[in-house]
């Protein structure tokens, strides 16, 4: 057959769906690869063709759209499963073509089994709630387009294994779950199950997400440098190892880039000739406040190095701070017989 623009296997769109539930999968061509939509393509006489490769097979085969109860169907640029089966797992290809044009992309679809508590290999989206911030809501995700607005589904919310009922601060409100005041104890996996009728059958959509309670912007402060500080002096003799930790606390801030860096005599360590290494470690509190430690290390310090200015810098969306380390050369201890005796006026 003639040439076809092949976008390959789009692993960025690793689609996971639960077994025995409906799934609607849009052809990624129109969302990410082509500059026109399905309607435009259809009007121009282009045809969308679907096929697939089963798991652990190499053979591409057409999708069977003649299954009982139209279990698999296509509607515009959407491939529908009503419902999925475990062996639907594989790589799916959508191809747009006419006699003069062809473009195609493949994507992996994994049908996943869940247990009685909704645990599964599904990669879960994380929703962050601010601690003690007032009413916040999460919404049952990815259920648009499954049923018309005239259909009134029922929605049941679970935390882990348990239906959410009589919780002090968590209230199910249809597609939304309201947290009156989020606390650390609200961390966990939340599942909504949407049940709706269609053509005399009942379908269920299960959606699980992880809730993580994080520091509130109300409590956020600029970075705080705990070390270096004015109380600690790094006093070294030439030839010794100089180790200076820079320890910085960052309040949690949504989408903030936290940065820590050292300057030596106003330059980045990479831009100077001394043999310096910097090791970084990061730890997080329960509310995702962050503590970064960068340890500046000079294996064999020289008297020149001990005269330099070592400054720790930190930056977040809340501001930038800097603190110089107090570094000095250790005065050699006096040799008792000569220096001290002289000091006492001995001859």
């Amino acid at each position: 057959s003639e040439r076809c623009d092949d976008w390959g296997l789009d692993t960025m769109r690793q689609i996971q769906v639960f077994e025995d539930e409906p799934a609607r999968i849009k052809c990624p061509l129109f969302e990410h690869f082509l500059k026109f939509n399905y309607s435009t393509a259809h009007s121009a006489g282009l045809t969308l063709i679907w096929y697939w490769t089963r798991q652990d097979r190499d053979l591409e085969e057409p999708i069977n759209f003649r299954l009982p109860e139209n279990r698999i169907s296509k509607e515009k640029d959407v491939l529908w499963f009503r419902p999925t089966l475990l062996n639907d797992t594989g790589n799916y290809t959508c191809m747009l073509r006419n006699t003069t044009y062809c473009s195609k992309v493949a994507f992996p679809l994994e049908v996943v089994q869940k247990d009685s508590c909704f645990n599964s290999p599904m990669k879960l989206p994380v929703h962050k709630l601010y601690i003690e911030y007032g009413i916040q809501r999460i919404t049952c995700p990815n259920v648009d387009g499954y049923f018309p607005s005239s259909v009134k589904p029922t929605i049941t919310w679970y935390m882990g294994c348990y239906k959410i009922q009589n919780f002090n601060n968590v209230i199910p409100e249809g597609m939304n779950l309201s947290f009156l005041i989020a606390l650390i104890s609200n961390n966990g996996n939340y599942t909504c199950v949407v049940t709706y009728p269609e053509n005399g059958r009942t379908f269920h959509l299960t959606r699980t997400l992880t809730v993580k309670v994080v520091g509130s912007p109300k409590n956020a402060v600029p970075p705080v440098i705990h070390s270096p500080n004015d109380h600690v002096v790094y006093e070294k003799e030439p030839g010794e190892e100089l180790l200076i930790p820079c320890t910085v606390y960052f309040s949690f801030l949504m989408d903030s880039r936290n940065e820590v860096w050292w300057t030596i005599d106003g330059k980045k360590p990479d831009d100077i000739t001394i043999d310096v290494t910097i090791n970084e470690s990061i730890s997080h509190s329960r509310t995702e406040d962050e503590t970064r430690t960068q340890i500046l290390s000079i294996k064999k310090v020289t008297s020149e190095d001990l005269k330099r200015s070592y400054v720790c810098h930190a930056r977040s969306a809340k501001g930038e701070v800097a603190k110089a380390a107090k570094v000095k050369q250790k005065v050699p201890a006096p040799r008792y017989t000569v220096e001290l005796a002289c000091g006492f006026g001995a001859t």
Epitope: F18, D20, P83, S116, N166, T195
Partner: antibody, heavy 117, light 107 residues
């Protein structure tokens, strides 16, 4: 379409056990709960317990705890309910009922178990 | 266990009548209530789940409402094929429990 086909009627002696089967088709057996409910002649419905065949999780009503065992065979999509130490008041129609969540969406046709000496 | 009390235990109404059956729980059940229909000699069938959600294929003359401890099943226009016993069932807290049933007959 969902179908639950139960085993045939049984007559049992007091003190013995009965094992009722429920063969499922038309849905993914491992993705739904299978409940067991009984109904004594002319009486109401009584929930006994349930199993999630996907992971074998079971829940039983306290009343039947220790006397009822619910199992599932994934290879044949069949659920079983075994009731031991039978007495005359266990005479009832026993139903299996499938539910993706907690409501029992579809039911078997029922199995009459008669306990008589 | 949660006790479910249904009333009336039986009723007789004419074709086309509006029929109401009530179900009361011994404690709040947060709308986790189902209604089942059982015709003589047959297995029960799910009519309504989660207080008001019509099960697939159930005629729209059936509707459910309620909250807290008190729930209602309404048949807006009784039909001959609605002759059956109706049961409520709570699924708020294990073990699931049923009401005693309401037998509906045609006058």
């Amino acid at each position: 379409q969902v179908q639950l086909v139960q085993s045939g009627a049984e007559v049992k002696k007091p003190g013995s056990s009965v094992k009722v089967s429920c063969k499922a088709s038309g849905y993914t057996f491992t993705s739904s709960w299978m409940n067991w409910v009984r109904q004594a002649p002319g009486k109401g419905l009584e929930w006994m317990g349930r199993i999630y065949p996907g992971d074998g999780q079971t829940h039983y009503a306290q009343k039947f705890q220790g006397r009822v065992t619910i199992t599932a065979d994934k290879s044949t999509s069949t659920a079983y309910m075994e009731l031991s130490s039978l007495r005359s008041e266990d005479t009832a129609v026993y139903y299996c009922g499938e539910g993706y969540l907690d409501p029992m969406d579809y039911w078997g046709q029922g199995t009459l178990v008669t306990v008589s000496s | 266990d949660i006790q479910m009390t249904q009333s009336p235990s039986s009723l007789s109404a004419s074709v086309g009548d509006r029929v109401t059956i009530t179900c009361s729980a011994s404690q709040g059940i947060n709308n986790y209530l189902n209604w089942y229909q059982q015709k003589p000699g047959k297995a029960p069938k799910l009519l309504i789940h989660y207080t008001s959600g019509l099960h697939a294929g159930v005629p729209s003359r059936f509707s459910g409402s309620g909250s807290g401890t008190d729930y209602t099943l309404t048949i807006s226009s009784l039909q001959p094929e609605d002759v059956a016993t109706y049961y409520c069932q709570q699924y708020s807290i294990l073990p699931w429990t049923f009401g005693g049933g309401t037998k509906v007959e045609i006058k």
